[in-house]
Amino acid sequence: MAVTACQGLGFVVSLIGIAGIIAATCMDQWSTQDLYNNPVTAVFNYQGLWRSCVRESSGFTECRGYFTLLGLPAMLQAVRALMIVGIVLGAIGLLVSIFALKCIRIGSMEDSAKANMTLTSGIMFIVSGLCAIAGVSVFANMLVTNFWMSTANMYTGMGGMVQTVQTRYTFGAALFVGWVAGGLTLIGGVMMCIACRGLAPEETNYKAVSYHASGHSVAYKPGGFKASTGFGSNTKNKKIYDGGARTEDEVQSYPSKHDYV
C-alpha cells in the first residue's frame, strides 16, 4: 500500500512539476524591467525565451518574437535547449510511469517490469527536473551579470544635462515557476525511484537464486530478515501467475536487475 501511495504521489508530483516546466518555458516573464530607478514608468518591458514584450500603461501590450536563431545569445539558446530537453524527458517519463503505476493493470505485466519502468521514469524525472533547474539558474545568472553591468553603465557618462535611463532587467515570475517546477519534478523522480525498490517483491531483498540440492526436494534459503520472522513457510519453488498481483511472502524465483542481496 505504501509503495502504491509513494509511486502515485511521485507520479502526481512529477506531473505537476512537468506542467510547471512547460508553463515556465512558454511564459514571457523570464526577465522583467527593474523599476527601482524608474518606478513611475508608463512603459513596462519584459522578456521570455521566445519573445519580448512591452506593456504600455494605456493597457496595450505588444510582443515580438525572436525571429533570428543565429543572432541570439548562446546562453539563451542553451537555456532553451535545457528546458526543451527537460520537457521531452519529462513527457516520456510520464508516459512510462503511467504504465508502471501499480494501480493500473496491463495484461500480465510482471512486477519486475513495473519496477523497471518505475525506475526508468524516476530517473527521467530527476534528469528533467535538473535540466529545468539548470536552465532557469543559467538564465538567472545571466540576468544578475547583465544587471550589474548595466548598473555600472548607468553611473558612467552622466556628466551631461540629458539623463538617459538604461533599462535593467530583474528576475521574472517564470524563473520562480521554473525553479519550483524543477524541484517538484526532481522530488517526484526520487519518489518514483524509492517506489521502485518496494515494487520488486520483498523476497528479492535477500534471495537472488534458488539453490537445489541434488536428489533433494528442499530449497536452500539464505538467512535474512524474512527468514528470522517465522513467515518463511513458502520454501517450495512456486510461481503464482495472478496477473501481476502478489502477496508479500511470495517467492520470485527468477533473477532480476532489481534483486538486492
Partner: antibody, heavy 118, light 113 residues
C-alpha cells in the same frame, strides 16, 4: 463613433468644490483609462491624472494629489473629476481624454470651463 | 519629472512652405524594449480640444494628412508640416508618454506669414 461629452461650465467660490463629468459613448468604457487635463487661460496643457473604470485604479500628478478625486460609474459610462479647496489659479478649462496605444490621448471631450471667483 | 521644451514659441510661415517645430525632453523617451520613442504630438485650434497628430514620435494617427510628419529619437524630436495650409494654423504640443507624470511642452503657435 467614440464621443466624450463633458458637463457645462461652472462658476465657484474659493474654497468650494467642483465635480466635472465626462460621458463616454462608442467604445467599451471599462477597458480604457480616462485622463483629465487642465488648460489655464492662454496657457499650455497639464496632466491631472487618470482612472481605469474597470477596477477604479487611479494615478495622479503630484501637483494635484490630495485635492483631486477621480471616479467612474461604469453603468453610466461616465467619469468624474472632483476638485476641492478651489483657488483662483484653478480657473481653467478641464478636458477628459481617452488613453490609447502609444500612451497618447486619442479622443478628447469638448472641455469644461471652471471659473473660481469671489 | 520629465521637462519638455518646445522651440520656437511661435512660428510664422508662408502658405505652402515648410514649418518645423522642435521638442526636447530632459530624459530619453526611447524605450529599449521595442525601440520606440514615447513622444506624442497634438494640434489645438482656438476654442477646440487638442487633436492627436502623431504618436511613437513618427506614427501618424488615422485621418491625419501626410504633410504632417514626426522624426527624432531619444531626447530631440521634430514635427514637420511639409506644406503649410490655412487650416494648419494652431498651437502644437509635444507630450512625454514615457514616464509619469505625463508632461506637455509649452506649445508652439503656428501662424501664416
Amino acid at each position: 463613433q467614440v464621443q466624450l461629452v463633458q458637463s457645462g461650465a461652472e462658476v465657484k467660490k474659493p474654497g468650494a468644490s467642483v465635480k466635472v463629468s465626462c460621458k463616454a459613448s462608442g467604445y467599451a468604457f471599462s477597458n480604457y483609462w480616462m485622463n483629465w487635463v487642465k488648460q489655464a487661460p492662454g496657457q499650455g496643457l497639464e496632466w491631472i491624472g487618470q482612472i481605469y473604470p474597470g477596477n477604479g485604479d487611479t494615478k495622479y500628478n503630484g501637483n494635484f494629489k490630495g485635492r483631486v478625486t477621480l471616479t467612474a460609474d461604469t453603468s453610466a459610462s461616465t467619469a468624474y473629476m472632483e476638485l476641492s479647496s478651489l483657488r483662483s489659479e484653478d480657473t481653467a478649462v478641464y478636458f477628459c481624454a481617452r488613453y490609447y496605444r502609444g500612451n497618447c490621448f486619442d479622443y478628447w471631450g469638448q472641455g469644461t470651463l471652471v471659473t473660481v471667483s469671489s | 519629472d520629465i521637462v519638455m521644451t518646445q522651440s520656437p514659441d511661435s512660428l510664422a510661415v508662408s502658405l505652402g512652405e515648410r514649418a518645423t517645430i522642435n521638442c526636447k525632453s530632459s530624459q530619453s523617451l526611447l524605450n529599449s524594449g521595442n525601440q520606440k520613442n514615447y513622444l506624442t504630438w497634438y494640434q489645438q485650434k482656438p476654442g477646440q480640444p487638442p487633436k492627436l497628430l502623431i504618436y511613437w514620435a513618427s506614427t501618424r494617427d488615422s485621418g491625419v494628412p501626410d504633410r504632417f510628419s514626426g522624426s527624432g529619437s531619444g531626447t530631440d524630436f521634430t514635427l514637420t508640416i511639409s506644406s503649410l495650409q490655412a487650416e494648419d494654423v494652431a498651437v502644437y504640443y509635444c507630450q512625454n508618454a514615457y514616464t509619469y507624470p505625463l508632461t506637455f511642452g509649452g506649445g508652439t503657435k503656428v501662424e501664416i506669414k
